[in-house]
């Protein structure tokens, strides 16, 4: 056998044509390599080490109580370059890279402090915005909207994460806005509001409302502006949460995990990395046998659905392929 | 106590230039939307241009491609180049804080067009 | 590009309540504001989102707006509300005045 050069991040399989496989498989309990190598010279059990067994049954192909899966023909497990496609926020949520943000319009009408609270429950926070350009992103989104109905203009102006501290009354308000919560990042601020007279009289914090223009005619997507209202008025708002792992059936996968990146591929397992899959493998199925026409099954690794007029109608390869 | 200030108008022949400046004071500028609206002489008001806070322009088709909205932060003012003017940019020149309402304006300043 | 139709010209007795009326295609889906302009001077916001007064705005001025028509209405006119208004709304213009209405006070 000649000498094995695996990539930094992998282990060398000592014999079998599976060569590399990522390095936290070796140890996690369950063999992957043909002649086992990975779960050899293993720590006693009850060890602690990083990736450990409680993580393998996110793993595609390793499922406990099934056979592993079998490997043939490629010697390597194929990395594979993540592409932007795959899911990195859960179903109803908007991904924006410049950001490795996660956006969600709510349309169910809350106060401020309820719709921070409802932003809190689901791991994120009221919005705010450090560049124009996420700004314009979160513009550009068409949201989910219900059908027309009386308040159809004010679904578009969402609660944000500001708030507008009065710090004089002389002919006018006078006041500047702040970041709502602490621990928010660099944000750039609203323009300064308008004030209604009704509602200038006891209150000495306003709350932001982005309202957004979409507009069947609308040419510009970033037309949008800015109020200052009674935080206790009822109104859509919008979260924003860090960007994370979402795997195929739309779980929330957490940091070091193995996982099935939501997106085109259900034969990828990777390891989740600041919200990121990072070291990807795929598996290779073989074509079904005695089958002209088949379509991959888009939830299931190797799962084949036979197209043939007088085909048996589900193939499984999962064990004639590779990871 | 927010007031807006234009200067820069004047008389000037098609095809010529001017830059029309706006100080503003009791607000900043840069974290505004600024506006310049125009009105022809006995007639309506028309919007011109906009700038956000981010620096993002937009401009009404009537002037696209030859007035060029700008802010100087540290002077906390408001700019509008003109080129190529046409007798129909006869006008005057607001500069107005906000976008989608314009809540103060400025006194304007006259654009005549002529030659 | 929104073609907001306003009447040219209206005139009211002091004391009475005028309505200026401003249409336009589907213009209840958007937020409209009013602007009152005096004869030499710049034009002054009364009424924004359709029926919010800025501070310092009589009372007197109210707005609505549904359907095709929003409306300015001015309660109790004083000589001093003599001036041109204008409706304003957002478009793929992207900003669009209506032509103006000329308001005068009787008397």
């Known amino acids: 056998r000649p000498e094995l050069r695996c990539n930094p991040g992998q282990f060398a399989c000592h014999g079998g044509t599976i060569q590399c496989i990522p390095l936290p498989w070796q140890c996690d309990g369950w063999p992957t390599c043909e002649d086992k190598s990975d779960e050899a010279d293993c720590p006693v059990t009850g060890e602690a080490r990083p990736y450990g067994k409680e993580t393998v049954d996110l793993r595609q192909g390793r499922a406990r109580g099934g056979d592993p899966t079998h490997f043939h023909t490629v010697n390597v497990a194929q990395p594979v370059r993540f592409s932007s496609f795959l899911g990195k926020c859960p179903s109803g949520w908007h991904h924006y890279e410049g950001t490795a943000s996660c956006y969600r319009v709510y349309l169910s009408g809350e106060n401020y402090w309820d719709a921070a609270q409802t932003c809190q429950r689901v791991n994120g926070s009221l919005a705010t915005f450090s560049t124009d350009q996420e700004l314009r992103f979160v513009l550009a989104q068409e949201w989910d909207q219900p059908e027309r109905s009386f308040g159809w203009k004010d679904q578009r102006k969402l609660w944000v994460g500001y708030q507008y501290v009065i710090t004089g009354r002389n002919h006018s308000l006078e006041g500047r806005w702040e970041v709502a919560f602490k621990g928010s990042p660099e944000v750039f601020l609203p323009p300064d509001p308008i004030f209604a007279s009704a509602m200038s009289e006891n209150d000495n914090v306003f709350c932001a409302q982005l309202q957004c223009f979409h507009f069947p005619t609308l040419r510009h997507h970033d037309l949008h502006s800015w109020h200052a209202e009674s935080c206790s008025e009822k109104s859509s708002f919008l979260c924003k949460r860090s960007q994370t792992c979402v795997d195929i059936k739309d779980n929330v996968v957490d940091e070091g995990f193995y996982f099935t990146p939501k997106g085109d591929d259900p034969c990828l397992s990777c390891t989740c990395h600041r919200g990121e899959p990072e070291m990807c493998v795929a598996a290779l199925c073989e074509r079904p046998q005695g089958c002209q026409q088949y379509r991959k099954d888009p939830k299931e690794c190797c799962k084949f659905m036979c197209l043939d007029p007088d085909g048996s109608s589900l193939f499984d390869s999962m064990a004639s392929g590779m990871r | 106590e927010v007031q807006l200030v234009e200067s820069g108008g004047g008389l000037v022949q098609p095809g010529g230039s001017l830059r029309l400046s706006c100080a503003a004071s009791?607000?900043?500028?840069?974290?505004?939307?600024m506006s310049w609206v125009r009105q022809a002489p006995g007639k309506g008001l028309e919007w011109v241009s906009v700038?956000?806070?981010?620096?993002?322009?937009y401009y009404a088709d009537s002037v696209k491609g030859r007035f060029t909205i700008s802010r100087d932060n540290a002077k906390n003012s408001l700019y509008l180049q003109m080129n190529s003017l046409r007798a129909e940019d006869t006008a005057v020149y607001y500069c107005?804080?906000?976008?989608?309402?314009?809540?103060?304006w400025g006194q304007g300043t006259l654009v005549t067009v002529s030659s | 590009q929104a073609v907001l139709t306003q009447p040219p010209s209206l005139s009211v007795s002091p004391r009475q309540t005028v309505t200026i009326t401003c249409s336009g295609d589907?213009?209840?889906?958007?937020?409209v504001s009013w602007y009152q302009q005096k004869p030499g001077q710049s034009p002054m916001l009364v009424i924004y989102?359709?029926?919010r007064r800025p501070s310092g705005v009589p009372e007197r001025f109210s707005g609505s707006n549904s359907g095709n028509t929003a409306t300015l209405t001015i309660g109790g006119t004083q000589a001093m509300d003599q001036a041109d208004y204008y409706c304003?709304?957002?478009?793929?213009?992207?900003?669009?005045f209506g032509g103006g209405t000329k308001l005068t006070v009787l008397g």
């Open positions: 009791g607000f900043t500028v840069s974290s505004n939307y």
């Open positions: 304003q709304t957002w478009d793929n213009s992207p900003v669009v």
């Open positions: 989102q359709d029926d």
């Open positions: 589907q213009l209840g889906d958007r937020y």
């Open positions: 107005a804080r906000g976008w989608t309402t314009f809540d103060y």
């Open positions: 700038i956000y806070s981010g620096g993002s322009t």
